[in-house]
């Protein structure tokens, strides 16, 4: 018979046998044979391979380095890489989150419309009228300018995004 | 009954030939690899050689030893496999078992045994 | 060829002994190791195939094990009916080598 083109799932071509993939966790030290299956071996320590495979040499787990604001977020295992984050007050550069940067700060007349986290930096928005900010700040949101009404008061300065209203006492004459 | 009865054995001459037979019954015998085993008088187990199924096309493998003198063959529709000994020699006194090969990627062996047939090569 | 080779050649023992016979490989042989029993005059009979897997209809008193190149035939508590030569076989590279037999005598 023609020997096979084509192999099951979790399976590889070889020498014109089907032999079986090693198990997520494990590298391969030899094919199948006719009389034999294939040999895996565990991955060893802060090694690992996450998929059905035919890798001879298991991957090194990631190393989250703290020179440069990395952590662990998650420790791997011999079917998982692990996963970095970054440091209280910084954020992940990309996806792969390999190296930090400091959180962006909101400056005077924008809010924090979304705190950062380990993965996303500070996302800012203006204060729109009616709101101020007068700090530089990665977690201040845009205040709501004081009512002077509430305090039997008279707004005496205008606010700005910048800067509260000032309020004053009444004109009495105006009585 | 699942069995294999072989048969051919005798005296031969050096350089002579002899073909041994062995009858299966009792299973599908074209689905199995059949081998051929060896014990010369008094002494251990020696493989042969053995031939393939018919998933693998009855193809052969020998031992070092009698490649090139013996060959394995099989009629499956007498389920009978054969070896053809030619250029016999002394070394080749041996009972010479028949043996139905099986099992799994996870282990192959000799699961069924004939009872053996005496082959004396001598002058 | 991987040579296997098996200890002891011989060995005397009585009804309800504990035995062991050990098989050692030239090379890793990854647990394809089948035993056979063979007694005089008979044809060899398949006990223990990869290592630890016991044939149907062999008595449990049998077991093997073993990893590498080192592997152990074990007969828990020998019978009148276990007195016979015990062989070896690797079956993980052509051409299929035998153990040289150990025969286990009645004391």
């Known amino acids: 018979p023609e020997p096979p083109t084509a192999c099951r799932e979790k399976q590889y071509l070889i020498n014109s046998q089907c032999c079986s993939l090693c198990q997520p966790g494990q590298k391969l030290v030899s094919d199948c044979t006719e009389f034999t299956e294939t040999e895996c071996l565990p991955c060893g320590e802060s090694e690992f391979l996450d998929t059905w495979n035919r890798e001879t040499h298991c991957h090194q787990h990631k190393y989250c380095d703290p020179n440069l604001g990395l952590r662990v977020q998650q420790k791997g295992t011999s079917e998982t890489d692990t996963i970095c984050t970054c440091e209280e007050g910084w954020h992940c550069t990309s996806e792969a989150c390999e190296s930090c940067v400091l959180h962006r700060s909101c400056s005077p007349g924008f809010g924090v419309k979304q705190i950062a986290t380990g993965v996303s930096d500070t996302i800012c928005e203006p204060c729109p009228v009616g709101f101020f900010s007068n700090v530089s700040s990665a977690f201040e949101k845009c205040h709501p300018w004081t009512s002077c009404e509430t305090k039997d008061l008279v707004v005496q300065q205008a606010g700005t995004n910048k800067t509260d209203v000032v309020c004053g006492p009444q004109d009495r004459l105006r009585a | 009954e699942v069995q294999l009865v072989e048969s051919g054995g005798g005296l031969v001459q050096p350089g002579g030939s002899l073909r041994l037979s062995c009858a299966a019954s009792?299973?599908?015998?074209?689905?199995?690899?059949m081998s051929w085993v060896r014990q010369a008088p008094g002494k251990g187990l020696e493989w042969v050689g053995f031939?393939?199924?018919?998933?693998?096309?009855?193809?052969?493998e020998y031992a070092a030893s009698v490649k090139g003198r013996f060959t394995i063959s099989r009629d499956n529709s007498k389920s009978t496999l054969y070896l053809q000994m030619n250029s016999l020699r002394a070394e080749d006194t041996a009972v010479y078992y028949c043996?139905?090969?099986?099992?799994?990627?996870?282990?192959?062996?000799?699961?069924?045994w004939g009872q053996g047939t005496l082959v004396t090569v001598s002058s | 060829d991987i040579q296997m080779t098996q200890s002891p050649s011989s060995l005397s023992a009585s009804v309800g002994d504990r035995v062991t016979i050990t098989c050692r490989a030239s090379?890793?042989?990854?647990?394809?190791l089948n035993w056979y029993q063979q007694k005089p005059g008979k044809a060899p009979k398949l006990l223990i195939y990869?290592?630890?897997s016991l044939q149907s209809g062999v008595p449990s008193r049998f077991s093997g094990s073993g990893s590498g190149t080192d592997y152990t035939l074990t007969i828990s508590s020998l019978q009148p009916e276990d007195f016979a030569t015990y062989y070896c076989?690797?079956?993980?590279?052509?051409?299929?080598?035998f153990g040289g037999g150990t025969k286990v005598e009645i004391k």
């Open positions: 990869y290592t630890s």
């Open positions: 031939i393939r199924n018919k998933a693998n096309a009855y193809t052969t």
């Open positions: 090379q890793g042989i990854r647990n394809y």
């Open positions: 076989q690797q079956g993980i590279n052509l051409p299929w080598t």
């Open positions: 043996a139905r090969y099986g099992g799994l990627k996870k282990g192959w062996y000799f699961d069924l």
């Open positions: 009792g299973f599908t015998f074209s689905d199995y690899y």
